[in-house]
Every structure is written in C-alpha cells, then in structure tokens.
C-alpha cells in the first residue's frame, strides 16, 4: 500500500507573530515526508510545502490574504520518496490543525522605541510601526494599518534615579508626556490589544531606552 508505515502528524501548532505564521507539527520524519494543505472554512484546500522533510511550513502568504478569516490546515504523511501518481486512490494519513484566526490570534511582536524628543517639560516618544506581510492594493501594511485603534501602546516611564513606573497609553504610535526638568527618564513600551482576553493580548516589553543616549533629542 502507498502509505505503509507512515505515521500521522500530531501536535499541530500555529506559531504566529505580527502575522508571520508558521504551522509546526511532530514527529520528526523517519522514512516519510509531509505535505500541508490550508483552507478557509468555506474555501478550497491549497497545498503547500510539498513532500517536505521539515516539521514546519510557512503559511504566511496564505493567511495574509484575509487576516480576519478563520483557517484550517492539515498535514498529510507520505512514504519517503513518494511521487504523486494519478492512479493512487488511497488517502494518506493526515491530521487537522486547530482553527486559526490571524487577526485574533497572532502574537504581538516586541515593539521598539523609535525616538524620543524633549522640549522643555514635555517628551514626545514614538513607537516604531512594524511592517507586516499583509497587503492591501499591492502595498504592505503596518501593524497600525492592520489593527487600527484596536492596538494600543502602554508607555512605562521613570526617572533614572527612581524605581516607580508611571504609565501612559495611546492608540496612535506617539506619546506626549510631562517630565520634570533636569531629570533623565527611561522608557519602555508594551503593545496591547485590549479586546483580547488571552495570553496574546500583550507583547513583551520593548528594550528600555533612556535619555542621554543616542535615540533622544533635547531642545529647550
């Protein structure tokens, strides 16, 4: 039989950050290869990663077509050296993935503070807008383009001489905060999608940036 001694894939897991989306599974293949198929609930199956010995498949190109759709993938197992034959009617073993809705489930990547500028007792802090592989009219969209006001940033800021972290929030990529004149401050930001209720509602914190270093400007 065409699928003798092949083992169905298991532990199918979506790994997705800022819409870069990879399906992972087990086991590492011994004398077998895999092909992945993906579809929306109402769509046709599309094959990807044909006869691969890897245990992951990058499905970003498919899911970015509509990040609000819900996707299902399945992984087929074939004997190593398998060649597609038109006469084969036996379906190879396969396993379905959990459903995946990119807009709701992609993790938020670690943000980066692009710059900060002090003017008197005000500091403007700008968060870098990350580019995604989501496209609209042949243009790549930023994270802010995709999520709009659903995405907020929390800024943590503190005097270099103190431990208490003040917070500010924005649904743009800019903060304007009050600071004490003559004090140096440090900053860190966190991306948040408040409407989410699961582990993926927050990013990890950005690297800390402090005044007196190269990212900042000071004007009286």
């Amino acid at each position: 039989s065409g699928t003798t001694n092949t083992v169905a894939a298991y532990n199918l897991t979506w790994k997705s950050t800022n819409f870069k989306t990879i399906l992972e599974w087990e086991p590492k293949p011994i004398n077998q290869v895999y092909t992945v198929q993906i579809s929306t609930k109402s769509g046709d199956w599309k094959s990807k990663c044909f006869y691969t010995a890897d245990t992951e498949c990058d499905l970003t190109d498919e899911i970015v077509k509509d990040v609000k759709q819900t996707y299902l993938a399945r992984v087929f197992s074939y004997p190593a050296g398998h060649v597609e034959s038109t006469g084969s009617t036996e379906e190879p073993p396969y396993e379905n993935s959990p459903e995946f809705t990119p807009y709701l489930e992609t993790n938020l990547g670690q943000p980066t503070i692009q710059s900060f500028e002090q003017v008197g007792t005000k500091v403007n802090v700008t968060v870098q807008d990350e580019w995604t592989l989501v496209r609209r009219n042949d243009t790549f969209l930023s994270l802010r383009d995709v999520f709009g006001k659903d995405l907020i940033y929390t800024l943590y800021y503190w005097k270099s001489s103190s431990s208490g972290k003040k917070t500010a929030k924005t649904n743009t990529n800019e903060f304007l905060i009050d600071v004490d004149k003559g004090e140096n401050y440090c900053f860190s930001v966190q991306a948040v999608i408040p409407s989410r209720r699961t582990a993926n509602r927050k990013s990890t914190d950005s690297p800390v940036e402090c005044m007196g270093h190269e990212k900042g400007e000071s004007r009286e």
């Epitope: 929390t154 948040v192 408040p194 927050k202």
Partner: antibody
Framework: EVQLVESGGDLVRPGGSLRLSCAAS????????IHWVRQAPGKGLEWVGY????????YYADSVKGRFTISADTSKNTAYLQMNSLRAEDTAVYYC?????????????WGQGTLVTVSS | DIQMTQSPSSLSASVGDRVTITCRAS??????VAWYQQKPGKAPKLLIY???FLYSGVPSRFSGSRSGTDFTLTISSLQPEDFATYYC?????????FGQGTKVEIK
C-alpha cells in the same frame, strides 16, 4: 465570570504590618494591570498603587511610597499589598481593581473590599 | 498630579429630577475620565468611561459629556436606586486621581 476577592484586613497597631491579598478568578492577572484603591471611613476614594504582573512594574501614591509594596504571584493568580509602618491614617477599606489597559481603561471590575483598622 | 475638582459635594433631589454633577481637571486629560457610583458598604461601580460612553448594563438615563477640562455626569430622571455617591476619575496619567465625590440624597 470575572471576580476579585480581597482578604487579609484586620485590626493592627500603629507601626505594624499587614499583607492583603487580591485573588482573581475568571481572568489571568498577568494579562492586565491590578490597582489598589482605598477609602477611609466616610471619605472618598484614594488610589494606592498598581502592578503590571507581566513585568513587575509598580507605582505608588506619595502617601504610601516606601511603606507599601505591591507584588503578584501569577501562579496563584493573586496580587498582594504589603503594608508596613502602618499609621492611623491608613485605616480604610482596601479594594483591588482591574485595568484592561485600553486607552479609556477605567477600573471596570472591583473586589468587595477588606477593612484595615490601625489603632492602638 | 492632576487634581479632579468635583462639585457639588452633596445635593438633595427628588425622584424624576434631572441631576448634574461636574468635575474639572487641573490640566488636560483628553477624554480619559470615568464616573462611578458607590452605595454604602459596596465597591464602586463603573457608569461612564471615556468621558461619554455608557458602560454595559448601565441605564440610559446616565450620560457623560466633556468640554475641555470640564466633565459632566447627568442623570436625566433620578430613580430611587440612584441615591448614592458618585465619583469622577481621570486615568490619563499616573497617578490616576478621583474627585472628592458627590452624595445624592433624597429631598
């Protein structure tokens, strides 16, 4: 169902210490920010401090800075308020509240409160 | 710190009356103002967020508005269950601060 339950309130002598707990259910505290707010008898609401359990960041009201410490144990889904060097003016009902970190984030969910009385 | 000056500190009104409570922020807080209702022995309950948005489950007789740094809570037709203390709160910046409260009593 989202619930916050404070405990640990008691009668304590001036200069004494007390630890309050805020046990959360129906959500995971590390995805949110937890605040402590207090209310002295017959008085208004006073913010005490916050913790972001995802990174341990905290900030305190000037009136408690250096005396109170907020912490969280994410494995127990519980936030704590450690109160040292207590004074008569710390007598109050202490509430914990959840902040969802939205731009408009008010304190949507509150616990029922626990009474701390500082008296000799 | 931003001060929230709330007035009046108390008022007497009758069922059916229109009641207005105001809060003035000492500096710009955008729309980051919430209103809470508190009854004796109970925790505060959220009524209004973002200055003018009615929280889920709150009766439509409650409304909020903003004019610059002035914020208003209006109860269009006071009901028996509305006799309570009301607080405004800014959460534009740390520390978040509350108004002193307005006690709404039966006339």
């Amino acid at each position: 169902e989202v619930q916050l339950v404070e405990s640990g309130g008691d009668l304590v002598r001036p200069g004494g210490s007390l630890r309050l707990s805020c046990a959360a259910s129906g959500f995971t505290i590390s995805y949110y920010i937890i605040h402590w707010v207090r209310q002295a008898p017959g008085k208004g609401l006073e913010w005490v401090g916050y913790i972001d359990p995802s990174n341990g960041y905290t900030y305190y009201a000037d009136s408690v800075k250096g005396r109170f410490t907020i912490s969280a144990d994410t494995s127990k889904n519980t936030a704590y308020l450690q109160m040292n060097s207590l004074r008569a003016e710390d007598t109050a009902v202490y509430y914990c509240a959840r902040d969802d970190q939205s731009v408009s984030s008010p304190f949507e969910y509150w616990g029922q409160g626990t009474l701390v009385t500082v008296s000799s | 710190d931003i001060q929230m000056t709330q007035s009046p500190s108390s008022l007497s009104a009758s069922v059916g009356d229109r009641v207005t409570i105001t809060c003035r922020a000492s500096q710009d807080v955008n729309t980051a103002v919430a209103w809470y209702q508190q009854k004796p022995g109970k925790a505060p309950k959220l009524l209004i967020y973002s200055a003018s948005f009615l929280y889920s489950g709150v009766p439509s007789r409650f409304s909020g508005s903003r004019s610059g740094t002035d914020f208003t809570l209006t109860i269009s037709s006071l009901q028996p269950e509305d006799f309570a203390t009301y607080y405004c709160q800014q959460h534009y910046t740390t520390p978040p601060t509350f108004g002193q409260g307005t006690k709404v009593e039966i006339k």
